[in-house]
Every structure is written in structure tokens, then in C-alpha cells.
């Protein structure tokens, strides 16, 4: 049977086992979760793309899973992140009363797997998947992120962090999902302040990274959502990923 | 409690040489980065040198780059300064300082009493 | 390196407010942190982080920090808070303002 050829990678082999076993170990680790049915978790995220059409999924599609998914994380910390994903999951591992996204169940089920189905066929597609910029925007991987990220976004209160990797030539960037989503979907009446976490490469780069034009430009952006904006210059990530590697120093209890 | 106790300052001619001692104690000292912060008679606080908490990274001030050293030895719990080529601007109380703020800020918790060096002929 | 700059001296009557400046180019996008030096004394650490005060440091002590200038504010001042303060920030390196005399008058 011909098959759709798509340029971006297949599905993550095992798709289905690991999702139901992140589904138990998340469950298992976190109690106010366990309630949680994770069978009908699968099937819910499976019904999402399954014999539909790998361009035409919608946020409607994953509305079944984010029911089951709904979860009640601390508005006000909440850590989003762009283009340094590592270094927001390690400091979060440490810091453990601050969440990204991939913290909640719904991201920590997703983080880094690929998936997409095949129109009026309950095959998953494990040779290839529609990739964002050469074949569709409404792609499962997409959507997904994009909803949840959403929600995520909209959840928040107070003073919320970014993380932003400050050796990349954009920092900030309009098209990243914290970029086209999360910024536009911060709600002003909850949210005081977008306080940004610039990460310097090294301790030898003694730039304001905080006046990079990306950053004035999502200043502008937030302040005219009516959100107070700060920024901050984060120049040691050398000691900080040698408290990810010893959680227990005594040094490592963050002051923020 | 955290204690740091400086010792080997004193009365040094110019060109001349010194090893200032800090022993820790109350923390464990190898989870820590520490440093030398110096203060001239009368004048403000200045950043000397910095170590990270192995000793792999050290850092130093322009002024003294090249003619200080900062070690440690996590097994004494002791932090040093070997100061070499000593001018009279060198002239300071200097204090052994512990940085804590891991992770997103830099700050000096806990300080020691301060040793005397002079440079003078 | 960032330059920080802090008015040598301030006078404040006790149980008034002391604010004390610490300006330099941005220094909103520093983390700044407060030492109190009494004389002959090691500095102490009053606040970190522009605004968070370490335990063992009294209330009246507080911090704000936002675009070229970092305030130390001290409220309902007391005899016992004549010293020098420093502000510090990193940018890489160490960097420390000049230091304010507080004086508490009467």
C-alpha cells in the first residue's frame, strides 16, 4: 500500500510503551496524580492523531487528553524556556518548587517523542512525520505543544521566569513556541511581571546580553500586553550545573 | 557555625612575596567556591580572586592577574593566596570570603576577620 | 565592568527611613547584593538578590532594584545601623560600589 512520504522523522519506536510507562512512573512519583487512569490516558492521546490525517490535526483533537491531563501546578512558579531546554529541566530537577512545562504530566508524557498517524488507518507511522516548516504547521507534534503550551501559559500568575539561552543570535525568538505562544497567551490580569533569565555561555562574557535587540523587542511586546518586564544576566552556569551533578551540596540552595 | 579564619599577613617590602591561609570550618568547605576580597586603609571593598569549589576554576582580579595565586586543599579545609611581586597598593586587610547563590545570583554569605598586609620599605 | 556609584555619605534622624543609591549603566539587569561594614568589622551580608534579606538580618532592611539604580532602604533607622554599606553585582566578576557612610544623627 502506498504510503505518505513525510520529510520530517517517524514516530518514536515503542511510541505506545513509552507513553504508558512515563504515565505510571510520573503517577507513581507524583500523588496528587494518582487518580490518574493511565490506560485511558493512552487512549485519549491515541485518539488524538489516530487515522487522521497527519496535516489536519487541531487543538479540538487533544481536548479528550487535556481533560484527563488537567493538573494544578503553583501559578506563580512556573519556568518557561526557549532554545535551553536542558538547563530549565536540570534547574527545576534541583529547584524542585519551580515547573516547566515538561514537569506536568501532559509535557513529561511528550518530552522529546515524535508521533503521527496515516488518514482511515489506525497505523502509526513510524518511517516519517510531517515536518513543521516543510510539510505543515498543524502537524500532532505541532498542535500538541501548542495546546499544551497554551494552557501552561494561561495557567500563570505572579511573577513568571523565562529562561533564555543567551549564546544564540536570537535570543528571543517570535517563532519559537515561547515566542508565538506562550508570550500571547500570559494573562495580564494574573501575570504581574515576565521576568527573563539571559544564560551566558561563560563566566568570561561580561556583556548585558539584557539590551540583545530580541529582548528589547519582547520588552515591547510584553509591556504592551499591559505585564511589567524585567530582565536578569545569568553568567554562571558553570556553577550551576555543578549543583545539578550535586543536589545535596549545601551550596546548592538557590537564592532567587 | 561557619568560621574563617585568616592568617599570614604582615609587614612585606615591595618585590617581595606572601602566602595568606584561610582555615574553614562549620560547612563543608569542598561544596563551596571561595574567594579573597582586600580593602585598602580607608577605602572600599575590592574583588581579588576566586576559586571554584574543586579548585578547577580560578579567577582573578586585572590587578593582581599574574602575580597571585589562589589554591585550596578541600582535604584541610584550607584556602590560600600566594602573593608574589607585592607593591604598595597591595596594602590591605584582606578577607577570605565564601560565595554562596548558587545558581542565579553571587553574593559573599560569610566573611573572615580580615589579615593585615603591608607593603612597605 | 559595570561601574557602581554610591554617594559617600548619608545622614538620616533615628526612626526616619535611610535610602541609599547604588547607580550604574542598567543595573536593573544585575542581581545587587548589600554589606554593612562597622569599623574594624568584617562586611555582613543585609540583602542579596536585590530584594531578599538573610536570616538574622532585622525587617527594617529592604531592597529594590530597577534600571540604573539599586536602593538599599532601611526603615526606622536605629543608632545601631551606623556603618558603611557596600553594593556588589556580578558581571563576571566581583564588583563593589565605593561604599556610604550612614550616619545616624543625635
Known amino acids: 500500500r502506498w504510503r505518505q512520504q513525510w520529510s520530517g522523522p517517524g514516530t518514536t519506536k515503542r511510541f505506545p510503551e513509552t507513553v504508558l510507562a512515563r504515565c505510571v512512573k510520573y503517577t507513581e512519583i507524583h500523588p496528587e496524580m494518582r487518580h490518574v487512569d493511565c490506560q485511558s490516558v493512552w487512549d485519549a492521546f491515541k485518539g488524538a492523531f489516530i487515522s487522521k490525517h497527519p496535516c489536519n490535526i487541531t487543538e479540538e483533537d487533544y481536548q479528550p487528553l487535556m481533560k484527563l491531563g488537567t493538573q494544578t501546578v503553583p501559578c506563580n512558579k512556573i519556568l518557561l524556556w526557549s532554545r535551553i531546554k536542558d538547563l530549565a529541566h536540570q534547574f527545576t530537577q534541583v529547584q524542585r518548587d519551580m515547573f516547566t512545562l515538561e514537569d506536568t504530566l501532559l509535557g513529561y508524557l511528550a518530552d522529546d517523542l515524535t508521533w503521527c498517524g496515516e488518514f482511515n488507518t489506525s497505523k502509526i507511522n513510524y518511517q516519517s512525520c510531517p515536518d513543521w516548516r516543510k510539510d505543515c504547521s498543524n502537524n500532532p507534534v505541532s498542535v500538541f505543544w501548542k495546546t499544551v503550551s497554551r494552557r501552561f501559559a494561561e495557567a500563570a500568575c505572579d511573577v513568571v521566569h523565562v529562561m533564555l539561552n543567551g549564546s544564540r543570535s536570537k535570543i528571543f525568538d517570535k517563532n519559537s513556541t515561547f515566542g508565538s505562544v506562550e508570550v500571547h497567551n500570559l494573562q495580564p490580569e494574573k501575570v504581574q511581571t515576565l521576568e527573563a533569565w539571559v544564560i551566558h555561555g561563560g563566566r568570561e562574557d561580561s556583556r548585558d546580553l539584557c539590551q540583545d535587540p530580541t529582548i528589547k523587542e519582547l520588552e515591547s511586546i510584553i509591556s504592551k500586553r499591559n505585564i511589567q518586564f524585567s530582565c536578569k544576566n545569568i553568567y554562571r552556569p558553570d556553577k550551576f550545573l555543578q549543583c545539578v551533578k550535586n543536589p545535596e551540596d549545601s551550596s546548592c540552595t538557590s537564592e532567587i | 557555625q561557619v568560621q574563617l579564619v585568616e592568617s599570614g599577613g604582615g609587614l612585606v617590602q615591595p618585590g617581595g612575596s606572601l602566602r595568606l591561609s584561610c582555615a574553614a570550618s562549620?560547612?563543608?568547605?569542598?561544596?563551596?567556591?571561595m574567594n579573597w576580597v582586600r580593602q585598602a586603609p580607608g577605602k572600599g571593598l575590592e574583588w581579588v580572586s576566586g576559586?571554584?569549589?574543586?579548585?578547577?576554576?580560578?579567577y582573578y582580579a586585572d590587578s593582581v592577574k599574574g602575580r597571585f595565586t589562589i589554591s585550596r586543599d578541600n582535604s584541610k579545609n584550607t584556602l590560600y593566596l600566594q602573593m608574589n611581586s607585592l607593591r604598595a597598593e597591595d596594602t590591605a586587610v584582606y578577607y577570605c570570603?565564601?560565595?554562596?547563590?548558587?545558581?542565579?545570583?553571587?553574593?559573599?554569605?560569610?566573611w573572615g576577620q580580615g589579615t593585615l598586609v603591608t607593603v612597605s620599605s | 565592568d559595570i561601574e557602581l556609584t554610591q554617594p559617600p555619605s548619608v545622614s538620616v534622624a533615628p526612626g526616619q527611613t535611610a535610602r541609599i543609591s547604588c547607580s550604574g549603566d542598567?543595573?536593573?539587569?544585575?542581581?545587587v547584593s548589600w554589606y554593612q561594614q562597622k569599623p574594624g568589622q568584617a562586611p555582613v551580608l543585609v540583602i542579596y538578590?536585590?530584594?531578599n534579606r538573610p536570616s538574622g538580618i532585622p525587617e527594617r532592611f529592604s531592597g529594590s532594584n530597577s534600571g540604573n539604580t539599586a536602593t538599599l532602604t532601611i526603615s526606622g533607622t536605629q543608632a545601631e545601623d551606623e556603618a558603611d554599606y557596600y553594593c556588589?553585582?556580578?558581571?563576571?566578576?566581583?564588583?563593589f560600589g565605593g561604599g556610604t557612610k550612614l550616619t545616624v544623627l543625635g
Open positions: 570570603a565564601r560565595e554562596d547563590g548558587s545558581y542565579m545570583t553571587d553574593y559573599f554569605a560569610y
Open positions: 556588589q553585582s556580578y558581571n563576571g566578576t566581583y564588583v
Open positions: 576559586i571554584s569549589s574543586w579548585g578547577s576554576s580560578t
Open positions: 562549620g560547612f563543608t568547605f569542598s561544596s563551596y567556591a
Open positions: 542598567n543595573i536593573g539587569h544585575y542581581y
Open positions: 538578590s536585590d530584594s
